[in-house]
């Protein structure tokens, strides 16, 4: 790999998946490439085929086992290699030692549901998916609510600095359609980043009662 022209970025979902993106300027779209994962203290190794996601980048998921199995720990180091086919041979393009619990990106929260809705407030809960038991309560969340006439990017972020899988949205407008999203991040890890946003949950506040000031 030539200086500055390639990039190899991977994240661990804390259970049994390492997702990787490899980009290289000037690489041919139809080049066949793979990611190989070799843990330093495990008997298994794993490979995934890099598939194009844009003009000069490829991605793949290393499936290490059943979705909720704990395949790696905080002491593991995984050597990741990008290999591309050149004729009958495989050429190593990049080598990276990867500490999984320094590179966390969890799955998006799931099972969003409205617990209770009123005219001005709404209580919403969710669950985390495929998150390691190692975190115990060391997680944080961000949430956002889409109001009519606004974009997601304009929505203010609500931060929950603890493992709290519910929120009570206040000061909502009666009889109004909203959407809600949440994402999660462990507190540990040098390169740990936010999960993707959850699927949006649509809800509608109750209409104000006629003749009453609610």
């Amino acid at each position: 790999a030539v200086n500055g022209t390639s990039q190899f970025t991977c994240f661990y979902n804390s259970r049994a998946n390492i997702s990787c993106v490899w980009s290289q300027d000037g690489a041919l779209q139809d080049t066949s490439c793979q990611v190989h994962a070799w843990p330093d203290r495990r008997r298994w190794n794993q490979t995934c085929e890099l598939l194009p996601v844009s003009q000069a980048s490829w991605a793949c998921n290393l499936i290490l086992g059943a979705p909720d199995s704990q395949k790696l720990t905080t002491v593991d180091i995984v050597t990741l290699r990008v290999l591309c086919r050149e004729g009958v041979r495989w050429r190593v393009m990049a080598i990276q030692d990867f500490k999984p619990f320094e590179n966390l990106r969890l799955m998006a929260p799931i099972s969003l549901q409205v617990v209770h809705v009123e005219t001005h407030r709404c209580n919403i809960s969710w669950e985390i998916s495929q998150a390691s038991h190692y975190f115990e309560r060391h997680l944080e969340f961000e949430a956002r609510t889409l109001s009519p006439g606004h974009t997601w990017e304009e929505a203010p972020l609500l931060t929950l600095k603890q493992k709290q899988e519910w929120i009570c949205l206040e000061t909502l407008t009666p009889d109004t359609q909203y959407e809600f999203q949440v994402r999660v991040k462990p507190l540990q890890g040098e390169f740990t980043t936010w999960s993707p946003w959850s699927q949006p949950l649509a809800f509608r506040t109750k209409p104000a009662a006629l003749g009453k000031d609610t």
């Epitope: 790999a1 500055g4 390639s6 990049a94 990276q96 030692d97 990867f98 320094e102 890890g189 390169f191």
Partner: nanobody, 127 residues
Framework: QVQLVESGGGLVQAGGSLALSCAAS????????MGWFRQAPGKEREFVAA????????MYAVSTEGRFSCSRDNAKNTVYLLIKNLKPEDTAVYYC????????????????????WGQGTQVTVSS
């Protein structure tokens, strides 16, 4: 800023192993990405490995063939380079380098990306 002193070089037989150390002093070691480079006689300095501030990612030159292992101990202000199955072509002066600018460990850095250098330690591999 930090000062760097390498140690651990020497004369080794082919097939042997060597552990190089680079001790940092005079600065906050954990705020620097660290790298190892080498320069063989009559050749340009070449990249060997680079590790991020916390050691969460370490990139290796493809030429290392999995024989090299770079790690850091921020509590001891030291970065290490372990070389296994040494070959005569590994003969070079090995340099430790520190980088003040942010490095995320996802690409191969150039030697010009590193601003602080040690004096080097000689590694000679005899066949």
């Amino acid at each position: 800023q930090v000062q760097l002193v390498e140690s651990g070089g020497g004369l080794v037989q082919a097939g042997g192993s060597l552990a190089l150390s680079c001790a940092a002093s005079g600065g906050t070691f954990s705020s620097y990405a660290m790298g190892w480079f080498r320069q063989a006689p009559g050749k340009e300095r070449e990249f060997v490995a680079a590790t991020t501030r916390g050691g969460g990612r370490t990139m290796y030159a493809v030429s290392t063939e999995g024989r090299f292992s770079c790690s850091r101990d921020n509590a001891k202000n030291t970065v290490y380079l372990l070389i296994k199955n040494l070959k005569p072509e590994d003969t070079a002066v090995y340099y430790c380098a520190a980088r003040t600018s942010y490095y995320d460990g996802t690409y191969y850095p150039a030697s010009s990306d590193f601003d602080i250098w040690g004096q080097g330690t000689q590694v000679t591999v005899s066949s």
